[in-house]
Amino acid sequence: DLKVEMMARGIQATRLNDSVTISCKVIYSQPLNITSMGITWFRKSLTLDKEVKVFEFFGDHQKAFRPGANVSLWRLKSGDASLKLPGVQLEEAGEYRCEVVVTPLKAQGTVQLKVVASPTSRLFQDQAVVKENEGKYMCESSRFYPKDINITWEKWTQKSPHHVVISENVITGPTIKNMDGTFNITSYLKLNSSQEDPGTVYRCVIRHESLHTPVSIDFILTAPQQSLSEPEKTD
């Protein structure tokens, strides 16, 4: 009896440009003789419903159809037919199929590969705003994937230790697609420093599926007209 076991829950995630090993375990009732077995890995893209060959191994030869794709001969001996892909790109997301042949038996399994990119975030003051006591603060997240992202603003004062979510005077711009398929977004907060207490801490919070925990960037409102102190990033 020949069986193939893929990643539990049938899904694997990796970061853009990282190396990923897509799991495929071969379960066979006898010791494996790699000279008489074959492994083929296929990918079906998310956009096209077409399968392409990524890597193949047959007893006396191996071939990578995607540069750098590899199955370890040394791991194969102990039943691990996992596929290593260095420098994964966004377009390589999709369904991967591991097909194992131990003549005359054949087994296969599939797994979804998800590729994510974490946002790079920064907070700065828009110098173009010249109205007295008014400041425009920008929280910019760039090069993230997939598109869905959540940016919120919070504040807390010395009087109240609780975070208050700010909903007024907040504008979050459209998501802009970069040439490489990643996305950028900017959220703006407008403040009238004359109406705010000096020492108030403002925070931009970024939530994205690539982040284990939300990323926060803080700034402290000082005296009017010199509103932005050194931002502090926490994650």
Epitope: T21, S23, K25, N70, V71, L73, W74, R75, G79, D80
Partner: antibody, heavy 120, light 111 residues
Framework: EVQLVQSGAEVKKPGASVKVSCKAS????????MDWVRQAPGKGLEWIGD????????LYNQKFRGRVTLTVDKSISTAYMELSRLRSDDTAVYYC?????????????WGQGTTVTVSS | DIVLTQTPLSLSVTPGQPASISCKAS??????????MNWYLQKPGQPPQLLIY???TLHSGVPDRFSGSGSGTDFTLKISRVEAEDVGVYYC?????????FGQGTKLEIK
């Protein structure tokens, strides 16, 4: 920085067992196999076997089959080598070594070695 | 098992002079165009350290005075100009077949 730190020296009686640990740090533990190699006093290197931390799969030198057990604890990035029914000719320095397995097969980082002395 | 035979078993070299070690395998260690032969140096009192893998690829951090060549059953490690820090025992190792085997070692000393 890649580091493999092995447990301390052991003195055992013939017939006993020994378990040597190898704590890995500075790399993704499951991306490489762990080789075990021994060296008897004044002698050359001898491959014992290797383990794939990804699935626990092992390959053993037939010479040691039935006496050696290789295991890993992924949660603490540690590999173990247990040798049973010890004999005096098992007296040696035992090394763990990180082994590349996708683009060739070679041991690029080694532990400091664990001296195992078998004596009655 | 694949048997690896190293020659010479010892050699004494003047600093600045070249050195060469041969490793012959009892059967080919090539697979699909690649040679699975590695070279290690074990300095006194230390674990072995990788010098060359896949017959001719220099491991990162290894001085370029070391080079490896060969395919099939015949392999050579060369040191273009021996330095005092090169003393120790040199081992070839094949990783094509299990058990992975080592040569018996070549001891290099400085004259």
């Amino acid at each position: 920085e890649v580091q493999l730190v092995q447990s301390g020296a052991e003195v055992k009686k013939p017939g006993a067992s020994v378990k040597v640990s190898c704590k890995a740090s500075g790399y993704t533990f499951t991306d490489y196999n762990m080789d075990w190699v021994r060296q008897a006093p004044g002698k050359g290197l001898e491959w014992i076997g290797d383990i794939n931390p990804n699935n626990g799969g092992t390959l053993y030198n037939q010479k040691f089959r039935g006496r050696v057990t290789l295991t890993v604890d992924k949660s603490i990035s540690t590999a173990y080598m247990e040798l049973s029914r010890l004999r005096s000719d098992d007296t040696a320095v035992y090394y763990c070594a990180r082994s590349e397995v996708f683009y060739g097969n070679y041991a690029d980082y080694w532990g400091q070695g664990t001296t195992v002395t078998v004596s009655s | 098992d694949i048997v690896l035979t190293q020659t010479p078993l010892s050699l004494s070299v003047t600093p600045g002079q070249p050195a060469s070690i041969s490793c012959k395998a009892s059967q080919s260690v090539d697979y699909d165009g690649d040679s699975y032969m590695n070279w290690y140096l074990q300095k006194p009192g230390q674990p072995p350290q990788l010098l060359i893998y896949a017959a001719s690829t220099l491991h990162s951090g290894v001085p370029d005075r070391f080079s490896g060549s060969g395919s099939g059953t015949d392999f050579t490690l060369k040191i273009s100009r021996v330095e005092a820090e090169d003393v120790g025992v040199y081992y070839c190792q094949q990783s094509k077949e299990d058990p992975r085997t080592f040569g018996q070692g070549t001891k290099l000393e400085i004259k």
